[in-house]
């Protein structure tokens, strides 16, 4: 099956790599603009230069192109705890990330929030914290894992999901009423 090509891809495929077809004259192939620049004017004729201009501050193009405007630089989302890893240049967008000892949780493909890595207090580190994953903790005896934190079994009631993990402790607490908390 031939993949469906958009008009721009169809037009570009007529020209050799690094060139695009003139929008007003399909017999002319113009040279694409380098990254860090954008198309100001199409080439006037075969073998003549495309008029490319450098992106202005606050904008970029990261690959060769024939865009009429540079792309706006991304801004790191402070309300999501993001910090700037590297600032925007004419040929590269801003790179955002999290602080040391934090990991990313993606709410959508392009939007992430920074969360603190679990320290595994009252437990041991089973897997270290990674860019997109919290630390995986193994809890010491008498503690159970709750949202990746090790919590004392004294906080476990019979009806909760910690019951199996804290079974000996639960059975030892004779005569206490089941609070029915869920």
């Amino acid at each position: 099956l031939v993949p469906h090509l958009g008009d721009r891809e169809k037009r570009d495929s007529v020209c050799p790599q690094g060139k695009y077809i003139h929008p007003q004259n399909n017999s002319i192939c113009c040279t694409k603009c380098h990254k860090g620049t954008y198309l100001y004017n199409d080439c006037p004729g075969p073998g003549q230069d495309t008029d490319c201009r450098e992106c202005e501050s606050g904008s970029f193009t990261a690959s060769e192109n024939h865009l009429r405007h540079c792309l706006s630089c991304s801004k790191c989302r402070k309300e999501m705890g993001q910090v700037e890893i590297s600032s925007c240049t004419v040929d590269r967008d801003t790179v955002c990330g999290c602080r040391k000892n934090q990991y990313r949780h993606y709410w959508s493909e392009n939007l992430f929030q920074c969360f603190n890595c679990s320290l595994c207090l009252n437990g041991t580190v089973h897997l270290s914290c990674q860019e997109k994953q919290n630390t995986v903790c193994t809890c010491h005896a008498g503690f159970f894992l709750r949202e990746n934190e090790c919590v004392s079994c004294s906080n476990c009631k019979k009806s909760l999901e910690c019951t199996k993990l804290c079974l000996p402790q639960i059975e030892n607490v004779k005569g206490t009423e089941d609070s029915g908390t869920t």
Partner: nanobody
Framework: EVQLLESGGGLVQPGGSLRLSCAAS????????MGWVRQAPGKGLEWVSA????????FYADSVKGRFTISRDNSKNTLYLQMNSLRAEDAAVYYC?????????????RGQGTLVTVSS
């Protein structure tokens, strides 16, 4: 067994309001981040809003910021979504979901959903 039961959906005119509720059971509600996920006809799932176990931290998608408010009542094991200034593009099935932090986007454990229709 984890159960999430949504209610409050319905037909509303553009500019109108709705309040969605989610009754949770089978797990310790107050321990978990909870949220609302929606799916418009022919589109994928998207996180609308989420709230930490204590209610001290929240997330809102840019498209709903300033219009929707998420809240929770841990004593009632209930999650809420107050939706104001509704738009046609807000029409979707809204699901209550347990947030699984890390990586993503993942949509955790979800309920059956409640339909929100925005039409004049």
């Amino acid at each position: 067994e984890v159960q999430l039961l949504e209610s409050g959906g319905g037909l509303v005119q553009p500019g109108g309001s709705l309040r969605l509720s989610c009754a949770a059971s089978g797990f310790t509600f107050e321990w978990y981040w909870m949220g609302w996920v929606r799916q418009a006809p022919g589109k994928g799932l998207e996180w609308v809003s989420a709230i930490s176990g204590s209610g001290g931290s929240t997330f809102y998608a840019d498209s709903v910021k300033g219009r929707f408010t998420i809240s929770r009542d841990n004593s009632k094991n209930t999650l809420y979504l107050q939706m104001n200034s509704l738009r046609a593009e807000d029409a979707a099935v809204y699901y209550c979901a347990k947030v699984k932090l890390g990586g993503g986007p993942n949509f955790g454990y979800r309920g059956q959903g409640t339909l929100v229709t925005v039409s004049s």
